[in-house]
């Protein structure tokens, strides 16, 4: 039970006191008592519940009533039933006893009255009316957690308009209203009560920027909605009729957790004593509502697609055709950004990362958005970020990025456990440098903080500055399996590469060529690939810096080796030193369920078919998937990216809810 | 082959700023590794900066770090270097310099260690 | 002072041969074979003539020539002209902080 205040009485005059319902009031009967006397005995309306706590115990009188000593080991403590009809209609009658005087009596007029703040506290997606409560004062984790859930209101439900809903202090219409979380003001007082009575909703200062709040008046109709809280206003004082009333407040978060917010944002109403004109207003009561601003999370390969996106640029047809088809077999919307509005940009995947934050009442698609902005910079704000789909981004908005602030740069695991840990999310995957030099490559320490900050995909940094482009997705993917733990991980592997020409040209192939078929392009024959030197200590090297991560990958998300498929893939080391793909990099695929767009290798036709192809087919057929091969070579490979560079995906989110995990 | 036409040089005091620019024509820079040389009046060559065609990694002089940043738009065709905090030791003329990077290479051929296309250059005077 | 040093003038006469050094060190010169040569006439931007220490572009004669050893590098020039009067600079790829160096330049005078 919520703490109350203290009341001190006294037999000088009556005291008048205020108790709200579902706290415990001290009440001091010994400051005042009168100097000979030695005990104490209580009398209450049937409507107020008096408890005294003394070691040792009372005596009990004759006539039934007890007496307790007048001594500081006494702790008076009382509560009310009822919430009162009218003011002090509640009385305490303290009867003060000494051996030689008759006893003394000190009179206490109560006021009981209900005052609660509500949320949705049990995360069900209602909100039910609770009393003041300590635990409301919390917010924890778990399936048996507590605690109300924000939605930072990124999305924009007017088309009109440019900027995110949380951007104004204005309630657009019920849909808008939807995105946020309701909180209900319950009081039940006498109807005087608020002539000598002020209720004020208050936020702190540090949290107040992050949050706005809205008073719904007249029922809860958008137009009927007005800001109390918000980065301006830490405060409001409300009007509030005495009798039985309910308020309905809707809530929105204005930021995502990160380095300098932990993401909760505490509510409080205060009930000011205000009756002593002359005097400042005195604080008689608080109810608190802690609130956690729901994190963005990110969606693995292993969910199920919804939406694809990609790029039509100059010549790229053949390439749209295929992932049109692609994606008509997976069942998933397209959505093609015209060559005018991606000014020649084709890296979709680089531009935008798509997610999801979720509240028990609502699930809503939230783009971040990649501060790389080169040509489709525009694209996320522009067309992604629309009624039910938020939009956020971090990261300097001119200069300052690098390569791998690029969100090939940005994957996320399927759920994993490691050890006793499980993360029912996964994990967040990014590329670094292996150590900070004077040229090194790093994501930007914005993006790292933000991700960071979100609690439910703890972050693995893993090694990808080796790279010419530096991205992850340049040798990791995950696809679904219907065995073990539900995915396997490809890492592209030169190894198994090589192994494979070998054996090719131990069966009399040596001659096959590889880039068959590709216009101005050097044909190289397999014997030619396995006796140049330079270009297999290239890949020993390559070798190591994807082996390095693949023992990071199996400590951080707890794999086997038996979850680990190797993709044949050589890679060339270019200017200062840097990996890129010998032929189309296969791991760079786009995964839309149990169909798979894979860059075609353009690997060397033996009996009429590709040996690459083949060994692909036969590692993850088995596993129910189906590969298609995408000709990406001129318009994608050629320029440093392959079929997942130049598409993006929006999942299913998560069927699991992110509060009930232990981060 | 690629043509190449620096601008944006000029005056400054101590401590400003100069962005300077590399137009290209005659072909697609962003096939192009580019890099920023540097001569300092009656003195030799110094290399500043480099930026690789996929405009993913950059590199800079000692001299340079931290005050001096390579980027470039290949919608536009250009590459420039924005100068910062500049000093009378940066004085000179600021050459831009490519070199085609070339899909069929199989192993490294050094082209972004070599300067096969010079621009005309544009001089920046620091001085107050 | 430059990472790479240079002789500061050589000179030939017409017809003559003229071998120009380039030292640097084993994080240089010793370690890559990415040196290049420049050659610039005054008030002119440098022209590359060598590359990968012994390849010429084309359009270069093949009076120039290139060759490594160890920590250095060398320039050559067959049968001198007056044309090839110039400052030539060598350059390499360097695994220090600066990962590319220029030599001091060389002043050659066809006498």
């Known amino acids: 039970m919520a703490q109350g205040t203290l009341i001190r009485v006294t037999p000088e005059q009556p005291t008048h006191a205020v108790c709200v319902l579902g706290t415990l009031t001290q009440l001091d009967v010994c400051s005042s008592a009168p100097e000979d006397c030695t005990s104490f005995s209580v009398n209450t309306s049937p409507g107020v519940v008096v408890d005294i706590a003394h070691s040792p115990p009372a005596k009990k009188k004759s006539t039934g009533s007890s007496t307790w000593p007048l001594d500081p080991g006494v702790e008076v403590t009382l509560t009310m039933k009822a919430a009162s009809g009218s003011t002090g209609d509640q009385k305490v009658q303290i009867s003060y006893h000494g051996p030689k005087t008759p006893p003394v009596k000190a009179l206490l007029y109560l006021t009981g009255v209900e005052i609660s703040l509500s949320a949705d506290i049990t995360r069900t997606g209602k909100v039910k009316p609770t009393r003041a409560v300590e635990d409301k004062r919390t917010w924890t984790w778990g399936p048996c957690g507590q605690g109300a859930i924000l939605l930072v209101n990124c999305d924009r439900d007017n088309p009109e308009s440019s900027a995110m809903d949380c951007e104004d202090d204005e309630v657009l219409d019920s849909k808008d209203l939807k995105d946020m979380s309701l909180m209900t003001l319950s009081t039940k007082t006498p109807q005087d009560f608020f002539t000598r009575h002020t209720l004020v909703l208050h936020v702190a200062r540090s949290e107040m920027d992050k949050v706005r709040v809205f008073q719904a008046t007249r029922g809860r109709l958008s137009s009927r909605c007005r800001v109390v809280l918000g980065p301006k206003q830490p405060s409001h004082y409300l009007m509030v009729p005495g009798g039985k009333h309910n308020m309905d407040f809707y809530v929105e978060a204005l930021a995502f957790p990160d380095t300098n917010f932990p993401g909760l944002i505490t509510l409080t109403v205060s009930m000011l004593d205000t009756s002593k004109l002359e005097l400042p207003e005195a604080v008689v009561f608080q109810d608190s509502v802690v609130f956690r601003v729901a994190p963005w999370i990110m969606t693995p390969n292993t969910q199920p697609p919804q939406e694809v996106y990609v790029c039509s640029i100059f010549e790229n047809e053949d390439f749209l055709k295929s992932v049109t088809a692609l994606a008509m077999q997976a069942r998933c919307k397209l959505t093609i950004c015209p060559e005018e509005e991606n000014m020649d940009d084709q890296w979709m995947q680089d531009e935008m990362e798509i997610g999801y934050i979720q509240a028990p009442h609502k699930t809503l698609p939230v783009v971040f958005d990649s501060p790389r902005n080169r040509g489709l910079k525009e694209f996320p704000i522009k067309r992604v970020m629309g009624p039910d789909f938020g939009y956020v981004t971090r990261g300097p908005q001119t200069g300052g990025v690098s390569g791998l602030d690029s969100f090939g740069n940005l994957e996320v695991s399927p759920p994993v456990t490691v050890g006793d840990k499980e993360y029912p999310l996964g994990r967040i995957l990014f590329g670094d440098s292996c150590y900070p030099s004077s040229d090194s490559r790093e994501m930007h320490q914005a993006l790292q903080d933000f991700l960071s900050a979100q609690q439910v995909q703890a972050p693995v940094k893993l090694y990808s500055d080796w790279l010419t482009v530096g991205h992850v997705d340049e040798f990791l993917s995950f696809v679904p399996a219907p065995d073990r733990k539900g995915f396997r991980l490809l890492l592209a592997s030169p190894r198994s590469c090589y192994k494979l020409f070998q054996e090719q040209q131990n069966e009399g192939h040596g001659d096959a060529l590889l880039f068959q078929g590709i216009k101005k392009k050097n044909q190289q024959k397999i014997k030619n690939i396995l006796s140049n030197t330079t270009l297999r200590e290239h890949n020993s090297f390559v070798e190591r810096c994807i082996d390095w991560n693949r023992e990071l990958l199996k400590r951080e998300l707890g794999l086997a080796e038996s979850d680990i498929i190797d993709i044949p893939q050589l890679f060339k080391l270019k200017e200062f030193s840097k990996a890129e793909a010998f032929f189309p990099n296969m791991v760079n695929m786009l995964v839309l369920g149990k169909h798979l767009g894979i860059p075609k290798p353009f690997g060397p036709i033996i009996n009429g078919r590709c040996c690459l192809e083949e060994k692909v087919c036969s590692l993850l057929e088995p596993l129910g998937l189906h590969c298609t091969f995408i000709n990406d070579f001129y318009t994608y490979h050629i320029r440093h990216g392959e079929v997942h560079c130049g598409t993006n995906v929006r999942r299913k989110p998560f069927s699991f809810k992110w509060w009930n995990m232990v981060p | 082959q690629v043509q190449l036409v620096e601008s944006g040089g000029g005056l400054v005091k101590p401590g400003g700023s100069l962005r300077l620019s590399c137009a290209a024509s005659g072909s697609t820079l962003s096939d192009y590794f580019v890099s920023w040389i540097r001569q300092a009046p009656g003195k030799g060559l110094e290399w500043v900066s480099f930026?690789?065609?996929?405009?993913?990694?950059?590199y800079y002089a000692d001299s340079v770090r931290g005050r001096f940043t390579i980027s470039r738009d290949n919608a536009k065709n250009s590459v420039y270097l924005q100068m910062n905090s500049l000093r009378a030791e940066d004085t000179a003329v600021y050459y831009c310099?490519?070199?085609?990077?070339?899909?069929?290479?199989?192993?490294?051929?050094?082209?972004?260690?070599?300067?096969?296309?010079w621009g005309r250059g544009t001089l920046v005077t620091v001085s107050s | 002072q430059s990472a790479l040093t240079q002789p500061r003038s050589v000179s030939g006469s017409p017809g003559q041969s003229v071998t120009i050094s380039c030292t640097g060190t084993?994080?240089?010169?010793?370690?890559?074979?990415?040196v290049s040569w420049y050659q610039q006439h005054p008030g002119k931007a440098p022209k590359l003539i060598i590359y990968?220490?012994?390849e010429r572009p084309s359009g270069v004669p093949d009076r120039f020539s290139g060759s490594k050893s160890g920590n250095t590098a060398s320039l050559t020039i067959s049968g001198l002209q007056a044309e090839d009067e110039a400052d030539y600079y060598c350059s390499s790829h360097s695994r220090s902080s600066t990962p590319v160096l220029f030599g001091g330049g060389t002043k050659l005078t066809v006498l």
């Open positions: 084993s994080g240089d010169v010793g370690r890559y074979n990415h």
């Open positions: 930026i690789n065609s996929a405009n993913t990694f950059t």
């Open positions: 310099s490519s070199a085609n990077d070339d899909v069929d290479d199989i192993v490294a051929p050094g082209r972004g260690y070599y300067m096969d296309v």
């Open positions: 990968n220490v012994y």
